[in-house]
């Protein structure tokens, strides 16, 4: 089957929320973990990682399609040290399958905002931090 | 279970210097941002400085800018507060903390070290 | 820089007695976090993002508040409460700051 990873951020307020969705059919959840690393350029695992989900096989989902599974991490007041290059990452225990997204950064400014690269084009954000706003 | 041990505290005329050690152990150290937090005798607390996970950035309040520097050894799950040009109003118990990634609270604190700053 | 201003300074509370500690702040900010120390000892994560129980806190506590506004209540005073309590925000450039404390005290 086809499995992938896509990383995507949202605010709500002053809170940032960091999504990492894996997509993957559902006999394929088991064994699974989705994992979000800060500035790890190689050694991204669930180990080394600031949260982690181990995903399950949910029986209540009918039919062999694509499903998806969110790990979110959410931050209630981004500040100057949360700074850094993250990465979602996945792998199966069973399969011996990795996944690693594209790494995305979150940059505080001299001026107190923040943005957030590296997502895709539509999901570049730019936050006005005291506002909690989309700038 | 999470420790932070710190260490280096002491008796030192102004003008002199005293490094800090924070040992840490229980969770994953390079993971997160550090931070000193200081209390005068009978007094309150008073953030002094803090340092980020991965790239190691630094902030500091004003008045230890310039004297005071924190850093950080992964490999030993350590952290530091060099201080310098210690003044009579820095002396004070410095607690070594954690910052917690998700909110902005303090949410680990060492015993604290004693630094007194005389003549 | 935003400053913290607890009121009261000291208090003295009855077994039972319900307890309000107020913390306002020169500005408007997003969350107020609280933390209890005991005399001698270090200062404990208490209340964190104005209402939110940090773990082992006993469900007496309380806090709430926004804007200038926050504070932290206990409805039944035990003598295990008896500490200085501390309110503590973020903010940019000042980033962490500290109210001065309350003091409170068994009757």
């Known amino acids: 089957g086809c499995i992938n990873i896509t990383s995507s951020a949202s605010q709500e307020g002053t809170r940032l929320n960091l999504i990492c969705t894996v997509w993957h059919k559902k006999e394929e959840a088991e064994g699974f973990v989705v994992f979000l690393c800060k500035d790890r350029s190689g050694d991204c695992s669930p180990e080394t990682s600031l949260k982690q989900l181990r995903l399950k096989r949910d029986p209540g989902i009918d039919g062999v399609g694509e499903i998806s599974s969110q790990l979110m991490f959410t931050i209630s007041q981004v500040t100057p040290l949360h700074s850094g290059t993250y990465q979602c990452c996945a792998r199966s225990q069973k399969s011996g399958i990795r996944l690693q997204g594209h790494f995305f950064s979150i940059l505080f400014t001299e001026t107190g905002n923040y943005t957030v690269t590296g997502l895709k084009q539509r999901q570049h954000l730019e936050f006005s931090h005291n506002e909690g706003t989309l700038s | 279970e999470v420790q932070l041990v710190e260490s280096g505290g002491g008796f030192v005329q102004p003008g002199g210097s005293l490094k800090l050690s924070c040992a840490a152990s229980?969770?994953?150290?390079?993971?997160?941002?550090m931070a000193w937090v200081r209390q005068a005798p009978k007094k309150g607390l008073e953030w002094v400085a803090s340092?980020?996970?991965?790239?190691?950035?630094?902030y500091y309040r004003d008045s230890v800018k310039g004297r005071f520097t924190i850093s950080r050894d992964n490999a030993k799950n350590t952290q530091y507060l060099q201080m310098d040009s210690l003044r009579s109003e820095d002396t004070a118990t410095y607690y070594c903390?954690?910052?917690?990634?998700?909110?902005?609270?303090?949410?680990?604190w060492g015993q604290g070290v004693m630094v007194t700053v005389s003549s | 820089e935003i400053v913290l201003t607890q009121s009261p300074t000291t208090m003295t509370a009855s077994p039972g007695e319900k307890v309000t500690i107020i913390c306002r702040a020169s500005?408007?900010?997003?969350?107020m976090h609280w933390y209890q120390q005991k005399p001698g000892a270090s200062p404990k994560p208490w209340i964190y993002e104005t209402s939110k129980l940090a773990s082992g806190v006993p469900d007496r506590f309380s806090g709430s508040g926004s804007g200038t506004s926050y504070s932290l209540t206990f409805n039944n005073m035990e003598a295990e409460d008896a500490a200085t309590y501390y309110c503590q925000q973020w903010n940019y450039p000042s980033m962490y700051t500290f109210g001065a404390g309350t003091k409170l005290e068994l009757k």
């Open positions: 340092i980020s996970s991965g790239r190691g950035n630094t």
């Open positions: 500005s408007s900010v997003s969350y």
């Open positions: 229980g969770f994953t150290f390079s993971n997160y941002g």
């Open positions: 903390v954690t910052h917690n990634y998700e909110s902005t609270i303090f949410d680990y």
